[in-house]
Amino acid sequence: DGCKDIFMKNEILSASQPFAFNCTFPPITSGEVSVTWYKNSSKIPVSKIIQSRIHQDETWILFLPMEWGDSGVYQCVIKGRDSCHRIHVNLTVFEKHWCDTSIGGLPNLSDEYKQILHLGKDDSLTCHLHFPKSCVLGPIKWYKDCNEIKGERFTVLETRLLVSNVSAEDRGNYACQAILTHSGKQYEVLNGITVSITERAGYGGSVPKIIYPKNHSIEVQLGTTLIVDCNVTDTKDNTNLRCWRVNNTLVDDYYDESKRIREGVETHVSFREHNLYTVNITFLEVKMEDYGLPFMCHAGVSTAYIILQLPAPDFR
């Protein structure tokens, strides 16, 4: 049928609560395109009737709520004037009772559900809520070990839980709960988050200078290999750590299974007054999910990011 197939990473989801997935493939979805969702290669599109439990809402597929039997491969077909792309999304639904300790560990959850707080710092956790505009999201409550979080050190601000002066005791199992209203009906969204604490190395009184990157985007074709250096100058006696992170997680941890994106070995050149450090990040194969994410180079208290961007289409 002339459509180019693109395979997204698996999404692992919790049953009995709302879920939505947006079919975006920049720059294709930025122009005049039609988007149609299908399940398991069916020829019949997903319903667009808003009363249906599973329906298409603009470019989104919306499950109100998701059920155990909804696992499977969903395709969204993006048709432009001269192009057609079919994006495959594998959804795996599991039953999880967050506060039932008798149930075993979670399957391999997305890293939105693994977050890091920095010891001794003011930091924050994010409740990731991805839904179309037709869904109104209500007040968010936060829980730690199934007890609602209260106290001077914690502030619920929009989708974040601000934590001041992070301590080792802040590690553990968190959950954020939001009420979602759609067509007059209310649903509960509950996201579990495993929080670990990291202790940044001492700063030795110096503030490292990141020479490159400079908070910018890089155009890169889908499927290519990409290596980006992070160049940092710092004092000779510094004790700062240098690393690449994505979603507040070390890239080597974030891509622990696939090893598709890795941090390189740090090298340095010694000058009279300072050292120049280089640590790279390697994308063995750039995938759709990499676009639009800030990949952060950290050097002590300094940070800089790159964002991968698809090259603009060449209409010559």
Epitope: P139, I140, L157, L162
Partner: antibody
């Protein structure tokens, strides 16, 4: 529609206190933080603090922590901001504000402002 | 506290011409969740401020599309593609990455 209506202008002497009210309507009062921002004459905007009507949790700018008290009356959907030990530099327009939604920040809704003049 | 620095202090623009205002923050406002916690407001004479742009680049409800926001983690720009008489006032940038919330000093825009 969302509306925030503030109490009228006040003239106070140095050392006195002032209590400004902000009456909310058009939304569920206990779901949103109420923010307070002030603006001295021909000056910029300064965030004073925020108050959650559901549990009376208050977060204050350290600059005001000893002088500001925020309270609420849920029966009338009103939040109060009291500033004590007034000095001439507290002469300003005081605004209450609410965010766009519960999950998106930015003050989309503002009260009309209350001018507080501190003069001997 | 995060310091927000705006430039220029004032701006005189011919109607129909473009205008640009800059704001710099003392700390990156790009969160690890990929949201940039940065906002633009316009305060017209005798009125409370009104929200123009939220999360760096999103147009607030009812704001004309001649306004646009862009930037990186620390450097931000508000552009008006064609200035109209009703755009006069003081423009403020603000952050809500962390408490205390802070505002820039303002940029006064007037019509030539």
């Amino acid at each position: 529609q969302v509306q925030l209506v503030q109490s009228g202008a006040e003239v106070k002497k140095p050392g006195a206190s002032v209590k400004v009210s902000c009456k909310a309507s058009g939304y569920t009062f206990t779901n949103y933080w109420m923010y307070w921002v002030r603006q001295a004459p021909r000056q910029g905007l300064e965030w004073m603090g925020m108050f959650h009507p559901s549990n009376a949790v208050t977060r204050l700018n350290q600059k005001f922590k000893d002088r500001v008290t925020m309270t609420r009356d849920t029966s009338t959907s009103t939040v109060y901001m009291e500033l004590s030990s007034l000095r001439s530099e507290d002469t300003a327009v005081y605004y209450c504000a609410r965010t766009t939604s519960m999950i998106i920040g930015g003050f989309a809704y503002w009260g009309q402002g209350t001018l507080v003049t501190v003069s001997s | 506290d995060i310091v927000m620095t705006q430039t220029p202090l004032s701006l005189s623009v011919t109607p129909g011409q473009p205008a640009s205002i800059s704001c710099r923050s003392s700390k990156s406002l790009l969160h690890s969740n990929a949201i940039t916690y940065f906002y633009w407001y316009l305060q017209k004479p005798g009125q409370p401020p009104q929200l123009l742009i939220y999360q760096m680049s999103n147009l607030a409800s009812g704001v004309p599309d001649r306004f646009s926001g862009s930037g990186s983690g620390t450097d931000f720009t508000l552009k008006i593609s064609r200035v109209e008489a009703e755009d006069v006032g003081v423009y403020y940038c603000a952050q809500n990455l962390e408490l205390p919330l802070t505002f820039g000093g303002g940029t006064k825009v007037e019509i030539k």
